[in-house]
């Protein structure tokens, strides 16, 4: 039975040209995290593999930095970066846990962070 929950940074906003940290945290399970995927809609941005470390997709290498921790830093944000991001935790023995973050990239200087929320 899967007992874990993923806590994410929820709905967040950031300024065009700036940076943002996407963060997820898996709790309430003793399962071993074997790999964390960061995905945007139908694209793979980066992977942190327990054995192989971080790998960034070639098309995002210039704008994506690993960390902090299992999180992901997006840099030089554009309005096209607005959308859903997913952290996918592959764990053993539990299986897969998925967290969702919605990022809005704003033209203006008004960018506020949303509240945290949980996905069971």
């Amino acid at each position: 039975m899967m007992t874990g929950t993923i806590e994410t940074t929820g709905n967040i906003s950031a300024e065009k040209g700036g940076s943002i940290i996407l963060q997820c945290h898996l709790s309430s399970t003793t399962a071993q995290v074997t790999q964390v995927n960061w995905e945007q809609q139908d694209q793979l941005l980066a992977i942190c593999n327990a054995d192989l470390g971080w790998h960034i997709s070639p098309s995002f290498k210039d704008r994506v930095a690993p960390g902090p921790g299992l999180g992901l830093t997006l840099q030089s944000l554009t309005v096209n970066d607005t959308g859903e991001y997913f952290c996918i935790y592959h764990t053993y023995p539990d299986g897969t846990y998925t967290g969702r973050i919605f990022l809005e990239v704003l033209e203006s200087s008004v960018a506020e962070h949303g509240a945290r929320f949980q996905i069971p």
């Epitope: 899967m2 074997t34 793979l44 593999n49 997709s57 592959h90 053993y92 539990d94 299986g95």
Partner: antibody, heavy 122, light 110 residues
Framework: EVQLVQSGAEVKKPGSSVKVSCKAS????????ISWVRQAPGQGLEWMGG????????DVAEKFQGRVTITADTSTNTVYIELSSLRSEDTAVYYC???????????????WGRGTLVTVSS | QSALTQPRSVSGSPGQSVTISCTGT?????????VSWYQQHPGKAPKLMIY???YRPSEISNRFSGSKSGNTASLTISGLQAEDEADYYC??????????FGAGTKLTVL
């Protein structure tokens, strides 16, 4: 449309080698691992190994280590398996299969090639 | 010899439900949720029906369901139809030994 297209049937002599190809299309090739699964006539499925182009990581089942080489050509979106020192028991249909999830976790396969029959006979 | 034990054959009449079992050990099926089921018609490639014990790919009918109890995983097919006649294979995945398949079960629709 996501698909895996495999090379044609082969007839080989015992002791020789065979190389089967699997060309992927319709998705971002490097993001998904591809495994090779074989099926001898009238028998069950047997996982041989797989490759994750994203990491360029290759895993081979213990039974086939030393006899199997799996490679990927990202310029043509093609994965290859080469099996050496062939014997009659290697006669089988060889399938390539794509991982269900990105990143090469390899626990389930959602897209399969149509299979390549390799016959080993003297 | 496969590490996962399946019955050689099962059968059922149209409209009935059938269950196919897949028995492993406390080291594989009993210890994790990475159990998948595949359907294979004669001369065709396998098709993924269930993954992670009980999850169905979006295109698979909800007549197919998966479950697990102890060291045994099960595939249940309800409202049996003629086109369900096929071979069914379970598989178990562990990061160390990768994927192992069961020997397969032939389902006959009477």
């Amino acid at each position: 449309e996501v698909q895996l297209v495999q090379s044609g049937a082969e007839v080989k002599k015992p002791g020789s080698s065979v190389k089967v190809s699997c060309k992927a299309s319709g998705y971002t090739f490097a993001s998904y691992g591809i495994s090779w699964v074989r099926q001898a006539p009238g028998q069950g499925l047997e996982w041989m190994g797989g490759i994750t182009p994203f990491f360029n990581r290759v895993d081979v089942a213990e039974k086939f280590q030393g006899r199997v080489t799996i490679t990927a050509d990202t310029s043509t979106n093609t994965v290859y398996i080469e099996l050496s020192s062939l014997r009659s028991e290697d006669t089988a249909v060889y399938y390539c299969a794509r991982d269900l999830r990105r990143g090469g976790v390899g626990d389930a396969f959602d897209i399969w090639g149509r299979g390549t029959l390799v016959t080993v006979s003297s | 010899q496969s590490a996962l034990t399946q019955p050689r054959s099962v059968s059922g009449s149209p409209g009935q439900s059938v269950t196919i079992s897949c028995t492993g050990t406390s080291s594989d099926v009993g210890s994790h949720n990475y159990v998948s089921w595949y359907q294979q018609h004669p001369g065709k490639a396998p098709k993924l029906m269930i993954y992670e014990v009980s999850y169905r790919p979006s295109e698979i009918s909800n007549r197919f369901s998966g479950s697990k109890s102890g060291n045994t995983a099960s595939l249940t097919i309800s409202g049996l139809q003629a086109e369900d006649e096929a071979d069914y294979y379970c598989s178990s995945y562990t990061p160390s030994s990768a994927t192992v398949f069961g020997a397969g079960t032939k389902l006959t629709v009477l």
